[in-house]
């Protein structure tokens, strides 16, 4: 056969679907690889062909579109399963071609099982709610296109295993779940089960997402440097190890990049000749506020090193701050014999 532009196996689009539920999978060619859509391609006389490779097999085979009740069908650039079976797992390829043009891409499809509490190997999207922020909501994801707007589905929401009914601060409103107050206790997995009729059959769509309650932007502050501070002086003798921690608190801010760095005499440690090491650790509060600690370490400090300026810097979307460490050379105590001699008036 003639050459075909092969985009390979698109593992970035690892598609997971639940067993025994409808699934509609769009050919990724039009979404991520080609500059034109299906309608344009179809108008230009291009044909979309689907085939697949079963799990643990190498043989590409055509998809059987003649199954009872049209269990697998194709509509425009969408491959439909009504419903999926466990052994539909495999690598699926969609190929767009005519006599002069060919382009194809493969993607993995995994059909996963869930238990009665909706636990499964499915990778869950995370939705962040601000703590104590006012009315916020989550929406049942990825259900568009499964039924026409004339069909009114029933939607049931669960937190973990429990149906949300009289949940006090959480109100089910069809496709939306409204949180009158978002609290730490609302952290967890929320599942919407959408039930709709089609051609005399009843189908269920199960969608689970993780809710994480995070710090409110109203409470967010610029970075706070807890250490170094004015109360601690790093007093060392030459030859000793100098350890200075820089500990910074960052309020949670959506999509903010939190940074901590040291400068020594105004330069980054990498840009100077001192043998300095910096170790970083990060911890998070329950609302994803972040504490970063960078420990600056000089194994054998020199008297020159003890005269340098050591400044900890921090930056977030809320602002930038800096704090200098108080470093000084320890004044050696007078030797005991000299002290005695002086005491007795020796010259």
């Amino acid at each position: 056969s003639e050459r075909c532009d092969d985009w390979g196996l698109d593992t970035m689009r690892q598609i997971q679907v639940f067993e025994d539920e409808p699934a509609r999978i769009k050919c990724p060619l039009f979404e991520h690889f080609l500059k034109f859509n299906y309608s344009t391609a179809h108008s230009a006389g291009l044909t979309l062909i689907w085939y697949w490779t079963r799990q643990d097999r190498d043989l590409e085979e055509p998809i059987n579109f003649r199954l009872p009740e049209n269990r697998i069908s194709k509509e425009k650039d969408v491959l439909w399963f009504r419903p999926t079976l466990l052994n539909d797992t495999g690598n699926y390829t969609c190929m767009l071609r005519n006599t002069t043009y060919c382009s194809k891409v493969a993607f993995p499809l995994e059909v996963v099982q869930k238990d009665s509490c909706f636990n499964s190997p499915m990778k869950l999207p995370v939705h962040k709610l601000y703590i104590e922020y006012g009315i916020q909501r989550i929406t049942c994801p990825n259900v568009d296109g499964y039924f026409p707007s004339s069909v009114k589905p029933t939607i049931t929401w669960y937190m973990g295993c429990y149906k949300i009914q009289n949940f006090n601060n959480v109100i089910p409103e069809g496709m939306n779940l409204s949180f009158l107050i978002a609290l730490i206790s609302n952290n967890g997995n929320y599942t919407c089960v959408v039930t709709y009729p089609e051609n005399g059959r009843t189908f269920h769509l199960t969608r689970t997402l993780t809710v994480k309650v995070v710090g409110s932007p109203k409470n967010a502050v610029p970075p706070v440097i807890h250490s170094p501070n004015d109360h601690v002086v790093y007093e060392k003798e030459p030859g000793e190890e100098l350890l200075i921690p820089c500990t910074v608190y960052f309020s949670f801010l959506m999509d903010s990049r939190n940074e901590v760095w040291w400068t020594i005499d105004g330069k980054k440690p990498d840009d100077i000749t001192i043998d300095v090491t910096i170790n970083e650790s990060i911890s998070h509060s329950r609302t994803e506020d972040e504490t970063r600690t960078q420990i600056l370490s000089i194994k054998k400090v020199t008297s020159e090193d003890l005269k340098r300026s050591y400044v900890c810097h921090a930056r977030s979307a809320k602002g930038e701050v800096a704090k200098a460490a108080k470093v000084k050379q320890k004044v050696p105590a007078p030797r005991y014999t000299v002290e005695l001699a002086c005491g007795f008036g020796a010259t």
Epitope: E132, Y133, G134, I171, E173, L180, I181
Partner: antibody
Framework: EVQLEESGGDLVQPGGSLRLSCAAS?????????MCWVRQAPGKGLEWVSC?????????YYASWAKGRFTISRDNSKNTLYLQMNSLRAEDTAVYFC?????????????WGQGTLVTVSS | DIQMTQSPSSLSASVGDRVTITCQAS??????LAWYQQKPGQAPKLLIY???LLASGVPSRFSGSGSGTDFTLTISSLQPEDFATYYC????????????FGQGTKVVIK
């Protein structure tokens, strides 16, 4: 005793302004509650005006007709709710009630004040 | 905006009667419905919230039902102190958050 007490109602000319207050006692404004204003014209039914979240965000919600003319606010340190009313019209004449909404109890409006009368007339 | 329509606007009943008031929302409000009782010169008093939950201290003769757009308040055996005006109140939290009241139902002595 847990209660709400409105004040600030008065006779005001059309086009004038007025600020209503609602002092809470027996409970603290906190992230559990929303505080709201509802009005009732003489001999008429209840009409929702506005709500504010008592938590740090202070998110506000208005009836479409109240947007722009009315402003809800609160001072948690004083445990007081306010309604600033501008460009007043004759049809704003009503008893104005403040109410507490318990966000931890399915949004129930569980506590109401006795109301303050606002009369807009020339 | 959501509109709440109550019926009837008034009704005459006797002590001991079973009374039913209905409330219809202009859009799906799920279970976001409350019922209030108001007596002349007084503030409204919460009876039912979340469509069917009885508020604290409210006698069990009051009950609420319904979801979506159609709701009902039932007083199983009318008592003398129940003669008052009753309001339904709907809420929508998703989308544009808003609350709205029905126009009221006045229950008078027959």
């Amino acid at each position: 005793e847990v209660q709400l007490e409105e004040s600030g109602g008065d006779l005001v000319q059309p086009g004038g302004s007025l600020r209503l207050s609602c002092a809470a006692s027996g409970f603290s404004f906190s992230s559990t509650y929303y505080m709201c204003w509802v009005r009732q014209a003489p001999g008429k039914g209840l009409e929702w005006v506005s709500c504010i979240y008592a938590g740090s965000s202070g998110s506000t919600y208005y009836a479409s007709w109240a947007k722009g003319r009315f402003t809800i606010s609160r001072d948690n340190s004083k445990n007081t709710l306010y309604l600033q009313m501008n460009s007043l019209r004759a049809e704003d004449t009503a008893v104005y009630f403040c109410a507490r909404v318990d966000g931890s109890s399915s949004g129930s409006w569980d506590l109401w004040g006795q109301g303050t009368l606002v009369t807009v007339s020339s | 905006d959501i509109q709440m329509t109550q019926s009837p606007s008034s009704l005459s009943a006797s002590v001991g009667d079973r009374v039913t008031i209905t409330c219809q929302a202009s859009q799906n409000i799920y279970s976001n419905l409350a019922w209030y009782q108001q007596k002349p010169g007084q503030a409204p008093k919460l009876l039912i919230y979340a469509a069917s939950l009885l508020a604290s201290g409210v006698p069990s003769r009051f009950s609420g039902s319904g979801s979506g757009t159609d709701f009902t308040l039932t007083i199983s055996s009318l008592q003398p102190e129940d003669f008052a005006t009753y309001y339904c109140q709907g809420a929508v939290y998703s989308g544009n958050t808003e609350w709205a009241f029905g126009q009221g139902t006045k229950v008078v002595i027959k």
